[in-house]
């Protein structure tokens, strides 16, 4: 581990003396002197600082721009930034969630493996043998082929990854 520095945790070194850092939610107005303490002021409305700091300006809260499909997930405070997420049916294009894109739909022959969230896109998977999807959807999983046997029917047309089997009546045995 690094050896301790001349100033304690939550202090900083300026002009040969240790001054207290400003607490989260406050900005530096003036450094301490030999005779005075560090002077800090609370961040204004729509501003924040999330660490012990010596910043002279607070950061602006993130703006969740509805024109980019964004909405507020969690309102910012003087100590935290606003957290944006995407409107229903949309998801963030990056971890910072600066803009949104429409959830991807899974094409016929593919089903939804994982439904999209505000921060992740739809995950599709190809329908395996025995399953199908005949629609383009952001929600539908691959459906199993109909079991003709359980209906006392026979397969008249084989299923594919995009179509269900077609069942029909069994041929009558002639005497």
């Amino acid at each position: 581990p690094e050896p301790p520095t001349a100033c304690r945790e939550k202090q900083y070194l300026i002009n040969s003396q240790c001054c207290s850092l400003c607490q989260p939610g406050q900005k530096l107005v003036s450094d301490c002197t030999e005779f005075t303490e560090t002077e800090c002021l609370p961040c204004g409305e729509s501003e924040f600082l999330d660490t012990w700091n010596r910043e002279t300006h607070c950061h602006q809260h993130k703006y969740c721009d509805p024109n980019l499909g964004l909405r507020v997930q969690q309102k910012g405070t003087s100590e935290t930034d606003t957290i944006c997420t995407c409107e229903e049916g949309w998801h963030c294009t990056s971890e910072a969630c600066e803009s949104c894109v429409l959830h991807r739909s899974c094409s016929p022959g593919f089903g939804v493996k994982q439904i999209a969230t505000g921060v992740s896109d739809t995950i599709c998977e190809p329908c395996p043998v025995g399953f199908f999807s005949n629609v383009s959807s952001a929600f539908e999983k691959c459906h199993p082929w109909t079991s003709c046997e359980t209906k006392d029917l026979v397969v008249q047309q084989a299923g594919t990854n995009k179509t269900d089997v077609v069942c029909g009546p069994q041929d009558r045995l002639r005497a």
């Epitope: 001349a6 300026i14 240790c18």
Partner: antibody, heavy 116, light 107 residues
């Protein structure tokens, strides 16, 4: 009255070490940082490092971190600087100073001469 | 590291003169500029801290000014005891650095 009394001049051999002392009086020793500097013959001043007598925490000038080691003894209100692996380039006057707003009070300096 | 430049390395003036010594920093040091006096016998004293604040016990004929990267020390009425070398030093960013010094002599 604030005073910093440094140890006397030293004549030392190349490759050896020397420990310079700086005894503080007239103020609360642990309330102020102690700064150390060097002045080579006919040259300006250069900062070596700083120590907090209350915690023992230090910051060094990268240039001197393998040369100088700063310590303090609270019981005697004394700061020390050990200089190691001395060469002729280390021949200089070494100063201690009390922090505050800048180097507020200075010791009288200690001349270290490195010579075979 | 921040470089402090004292362009005048030596200066001659007469007793009673107004003398100005300058110091330029390689970047903004937010007024954390201190001035020291080193007498011929080697003793060093703080004169001015934070650009313009007079250290306790320092005569009022010493004053400092400046901002950003340009700073100066003024002695308004030069006296014999002011014969010394004057150094500037920045306390804004580690490592602390000093100017090369300006040696003041009597004409």
């Amino acid at each position: 009255e604030v005073q910093l009394e440094q140890s006397g001049a030293e004549l030392v051999r190349p490759g050896t070490s020397v420990k310079v002392s700086c005894k503080a009086s007239g103020y609360a020793f642990t309330n102020y940082l102690i700064e150390w500097g060097i002045q080579r013959p006919g040259q300006g001043l250069e900062w070596i490092g700083v120590i907090n007598p209350g915690t023992g925490g230090t910051n060094y000038n990268e240039k001197f971190k393998d040369k100088a080691t700063l310590t303090t003894d609270k019981s005697s209100s004394t700061a020390y600087m050990q200089l190691s692996s001395l060469t002729s380039d280390d021949s200089a006057v070494y100063f201690c100073a009390r922090g505050g707003s800048g180097f507020a009070y200075w010791g009288q300096g200690t001349l270290v001469t490195v010579s075979a | 590291d921040i470089v402090l430049t004292q362009t005048t390395s030596s200066l001659s003036a007469s007793l009673g003169d107004r003398v100005t010594i300058s110091c330029r920093a390689s970047q903004d040091i937010n007024n954390y500029l201190n001035w020291y006096q080193q007498k011929p016998d080697g003793t060093v004293k703080l004169l001015i801290y934070y650009t313009s604040r007079l250290h306790s016990g320092v005569p009022s004929r010493f004053s400092g000014s400046g901002s950003g990267t340009d700073y100066s020390l003024t002695i308004s009425n030069l006296e014999q005891e002011d014969i010394a070398t004057y150094f500037c030093q920045q306390g804004n960013t580690l490592p602390w650095t000093f100017g090369g010094g300006t040696k003041l002599e009597i004409k």
